[in-house]
């Protein structure tokens, strides 16, 4: 069983009094159908809460909303609905919060049917004041901020126009018509697809991909026969229709679309899809759907150019386009990802990789856990994690797995222990080493969150009954204390804490119901007095990530280097603090074949670290398409894994000879690219 409140646990002294002095209740004088909450800026303490109520009438929606603001992390709220002239705010657009600490907020209002355009309310002072602006168009999407300049906004209109503002929504200009999808790239570049004939749907596979680097003064067509496009890390991807049939292929560019290369990935048919699961500046994880309605596909990992792909994982669960996948980046430890596979018997199993997709394995069975009914062998089984797919299937799973970059090594997730994911009520498990080992943390489903960079974990039981108890742990989930935060239980709807896990405040949201009334209520608990002193050097200990065998000279080496971290000792009850920076020390490892992926035309036989030539290509000149030219590849079959920092040791070399022949690609080649000006 999970550790409880017994004599073995180091109890925090006088915590009830300390927490009672730091528990703040706020009752909202309405109960509207929904509540949405947004944090404005980082470490500002500003929260906006929008409560909305709407009744769809025959010709229009009648609605009401209220806007509340807190500037003390949710301890107190002020009704600021008058700042937006008591206007009904459209919840489907949410609250568009500006990047970083810009303090910018855009709220999109509901307007009456006959109006010329929409209406927005803009704030650039962390929602202290709002300016009403009437738009020359009806927005179809939420306003999108440029990541580089929060004054630059783009939006699509219901008429498929692409609109841009250069002064934070004060003035708007339509820069292009017939636009299907638009995205900000780097350096204030906008990428978008356009249709020529009927509509986005009708022209799917015949769209053009355009780019503007000057907010619509001039344009460049960078692709034709486009089905869709996506951005990931420094890569621009486009799926492009083939000339001969209805299949499409991925093309990739690392220079904003000036030159393209065909990705060495299988082509897909009409019913299939590609999906970028994760991407960074080094590489990309790409899911390629299997033909037919299988619900699975294959994960491929790219080289540093996004062109050569290695098969990473078969039978990867991904239900449909835009459907559910359990693919999760474990942000608390470099190189770790968790996902689910659909096995031959249609059961779902969890897999984990510690080396960025190089090898996948089952999760180790937690110590002191029994294998459940799904296990053939009661002594040998694995932990299986519930994520998006389980949530979509309405299993009793209130939350997806949780990890935070500044809470090193910590992963919290619902799971079951057996041969496959179980439909039984799950328990909550924790790993403190990035997924290598697991322990049952709490019995039954819970909501959970990480505070103070891992110094505190907070949990609330998932129950259909009203609740008034919160649990917290100061030792990474080993021991738990319970605190009754109110005498009158509430129907719990959610836990809210500031993104980034640096805060020591948690807000518990819910509503109360009595005979005649029901009201939204929030309780904000500040844990600062539980962690009453700042952590010192003696509170930290040194930890080697990815350690599996101390007797191995290269223990801890992942992607060519090992990292040692200063981690808070489990027995230390102290504040990491808002300014806490993870202290780590990398050291370079010697290269081995594990640090290389197989180059184009090569593959790794199972359980072998050597790359061998693909049989169908044996003896052929390896010619492939790169930057719109045909290349001849002289290789011994290896290419360094993206992001790998190893030095010395094994060093297989490769060489590329440029044949300077144009590729016969149906994709728009560089010399055909045209520039247009507005």
């Amino acid at each position: 069983s999970a550790p409880g409140e017994d004599e073995e646990c180091g109890r925090v002294r006088d915590f009830v009094a300390k927490l009672a002095n730091n528990t703040h209740q706020h009752v909202f004088d309405d109960l509207r159908a929904s509540v949405s909450l947004s944090w404005v800026g980082d470490s500002t303490g500003v929260i906006l809460v929008l409560t909305t109520f709407h009744v769809p009438l025959v010709i229009m929606t009648f609605g009401q909303s209220k806007l509340y603001r807190s500037e003390d992390y949710g301890k107190n709220f002020k009704d600021i609905t008058d700042l937006i002239n008591n206007t009904f705010i459209r919840t489907e657009f949410g609250m568009a919060i500006g990047p970083e600490n810009s303090g910018k907020v855009v709220l999109t209002a509901e307007v009456s049917g006959g109006s010329r355009g929409g209406r927005i309310f803009r704030s650039s002072d962390f929602a202290k004041n709002f300016v009403q602006t009437d738009l020359p168009f009806h927005p179809l999407t939420q306003m999108m901020y440029s990541p580089q300049n929060s004054d630059y906004l783009l939006a699509l209109s219901t008429e498929n126009g692409l609109w841009v503002s250069k002064n934070f929504g004060g003035k708007w200009e339509e820069i292009h018509k017939a636009v299907c999808l638009a995205k900000w790239g780097s350096d204030n570049t906008i990428f978008f697809t356009t249709y020529a004939n009927g509509s986005c749907k009708a022209d799917l596979g015949a769209l053009e991909l355009w780019r503007t680097s000057d907010l619509g003064k001039s344009f460049k067509t960078i692709g034709v026969k486009i089905y869709s496009f996506g951005l990931g890390g420094r890569f621009l991807f486009a799926s492009v229709m083939a000339d001969k049939d209805t299949t499409r292929r991925i093309h990739v560019s690392t220079d904003q679309g000036d030159t393209w290369s065909m990705a060495q990935l299988p082509s897909v048919g009409q019913e299939q899809f590609y999906s970028i699961l994760a991407a960074n500046d080094d590489m990309v994880f790409m899911h390629v759907d299997e033909p037919g309605d299988t619900g699975f596909g294959t994960i491929f990992t790219s080289d540093d150019r996004g062109i050569v792909y290695s098969k990473s994982l078969d039978r990867h669960l991904y239900t449909t386009t835009g459907g559910e996948t359990d693919f999760t980046n474990v942000t608390s430890l470099r190189g770790v990802y968790i996902t689910s596979v659909l096995s031959e018997d249609n059961s779902i199993q969890t897999m984990i990789t510690f080396d960025q997709g190089g090898r996948w394995t089952h999760l180790r069975k937690p110590e002191n856990s029994e294998c459940d009914a799904t296990a053939k062998n009661k002594n040998e089984c694995s932990l299986h994690i519930h994520a998006s797919y389980s949530i979509s299937q309405k299993l009793n799973v209130p939350m997806a797995p949780l990890s935070e970059p500044n809470a090193v090594g910590i992963v919290i997730a619902h799971g079951s222990v057996g041969d496959a994911i179980s439909v039984m009520v799950p328990d909550v498990y924790i790993s403190d080493d990035g997924g290598y080992s697991w322990t049952k943390m709490l019995e039954g489903p819970h909501y959970y969150t990480i505070l103070d960079s891992g110094g505190i974990i907070v949990a609330i039981e998932h129950s259909s009954r009203p609740i008034n108890v919160i649990k917290f742990s100061t030792d990474e989930g080993q021991c738990w204390q319970t605190y009754t935060f109110t005498r009158d239980p509430i129907y719990f709807t959610g836990l809210a804490s500031e993104p980034g896990a640096r805060s020591m405040n948690i807000s518990i949201w819910g509503f109360t119901e009595s005979f005649l009334t029901s009201q939204w209520v929030s309780y904000t608990i500040d844990f600062k007095d539980i962690l009453e002193r700042n952590c010192e050097e003696k509170d930290y200990t040194i930890w080697l990530a990815h350690s599996t065998d101390p007797e191995d000279y290269e223990d801890g080496c992942i992607l060519g280097y090992k990292e040692q971290f200063l981690r808070l000792r489990k027995s230390s009850v102290c504040q990491n603090g808002r300014d806490y920076v993870v202290t780590k020390q990398p050291s370079i490892c010697l290269c081995s074949l594990e640090d290389f992926l197989c180059d184009f035309g090569y593959y790794r036989p199972e359980n072998d670290s050597k790359c061998v030539e693909q049989p169908e290509l044996k003896g052929h000149d390896l010619e492939f398409c790169l930057y719109g030219r045909e290349e001849h590849l002289t290789t011994n079959g290896y290419r360094k894994i993206p992001g790998d920092k190893c030095q010395g040791g094994v060093n297989p070399v490769r060489e590329v000879k440029d044949l300077k022949k144009k590729c016969t690609s149906n994709f728009l080649s560089p010399e055909k690219q045209n520039s247009k000006s507005n």
């Epitope: 040194i542 191995d552 801890g556 027995s571």
Partner: antibody
Framework: QVQLVQSGAEVKKPGSSVKVSCKAS????????ISWVRQAPGQGLEWMGG????????NYAQKFQGRVTITADESTSTAYMELSSLRSEDTAVYYC?????????????????WGQGTTVTVSS | DIQMTQSPSTLSASVGDRVTITCRAS??????LAWYQQKPGKAPKLLIY???SLESGVPSRFSGSGSGTEFTLTISSLQPDDFATYYC????????FGGGTKVEIK
């Protein structure tokens, strides 16, 4: 089998410094922390500090902070402990010991291999 | 720093006796406790790590238990070779040792 071999006995004057070495053989020196523990005549064990050879990450007991320096040379698989401003109370047997390790934590699993000890006598 | 209090400081026992030594930490150290045996003129020898895990090569008559702040080392049947001084050591703060328990012949 891992072995830790320490340098020989030392006699030192008060106020001077002593540097004791600890050479490892037969194991992966770099992957384990080395602790230094001392034992005054007829007394108990006292931890002075430790070092992780990879990166040379050292930490010290509060009592010895500023007076002890622990270093490691990966190329020779040797750890060193230097104690300065010696006084008569520093007369003791000084041990180096390898911290056993089962996970990524260096100091949590006890000291599984010990050196033979180095006697340091501080006398005027 | 975390203080470790060991008791008793001296223990007289006979061969075949069941011997129990207690160690108390000034604050919770979870299971991060080790036990050592030391004979005169020799370096200490690790017996138990992580409160209850037996170090390889150590006879099974030695066992450890406890968690949090209270720990015990038990020798189920004392052998002639077991007369020595025993130390507990916590590993979750800066390392500290208990004062030692001398097991002598009754």
């Amino acid at each position: 089998q891992v072995q830790l071999v320490q340098s020989g006995a030392e006699v030192k004057k008060p106020g001077s410094s002593v540097k004791v070495s600890c050479k490892a053989s037969g194991g992966t020196f770099r992957n384990y922390a080395i602790s230094w523990v001392r034992q005054a005549p007829g007394q108990g064990l006292e931890w002075m500090g430790g070092i992780i050879p990879i990166g040379g990450w050292a930490n010290y007991a509060q009592k010895f902070q500023g007076r002890v320096t622990i270093t490691a040379d990966e190329s020779t698989s040797t750890a060193y402990m230097e104690l300065s401003s010696l006084r008569s109370e520093d007369t003791a047997v000084y041990y180096c010991a390898r911290q056993g390790r089962k996970t990524g934590y260096y100091y949590y699993y006890g000291m599984d291999v010990w050196g033979q000890g180095t006697t340091v006598t501080v006398s005027s | 720093d975390i203080q470790m209090t060991q008791s008793p400081s001296t223990l007289s026992a006979s061969v075949g006796d069941r011997v129990t030594i207690t160690c108390r930490a000034s604050q919770s150290i979870s299971s991060w406790l080790a036990w050592y045996q030391q004979k005169p003129g020799k370096a200490p020898k690790l017996l138990i790590y992580k409160a209850s895990s037996l170090e390889s090569g150590v006879p099974s008559r030695f066992s450890g238990s406890g968690s949090g702040t209270e720990f015990t080392l038990t020798i189920s049947s004392l052998q002639p070779d077991d007369f020595a001084t025993y130390y507990c050591q916590q590993a979750d703060g800066h390392i500290t040792f208990g004062g030692g328990t001398k097991v002598e012949i009754k």
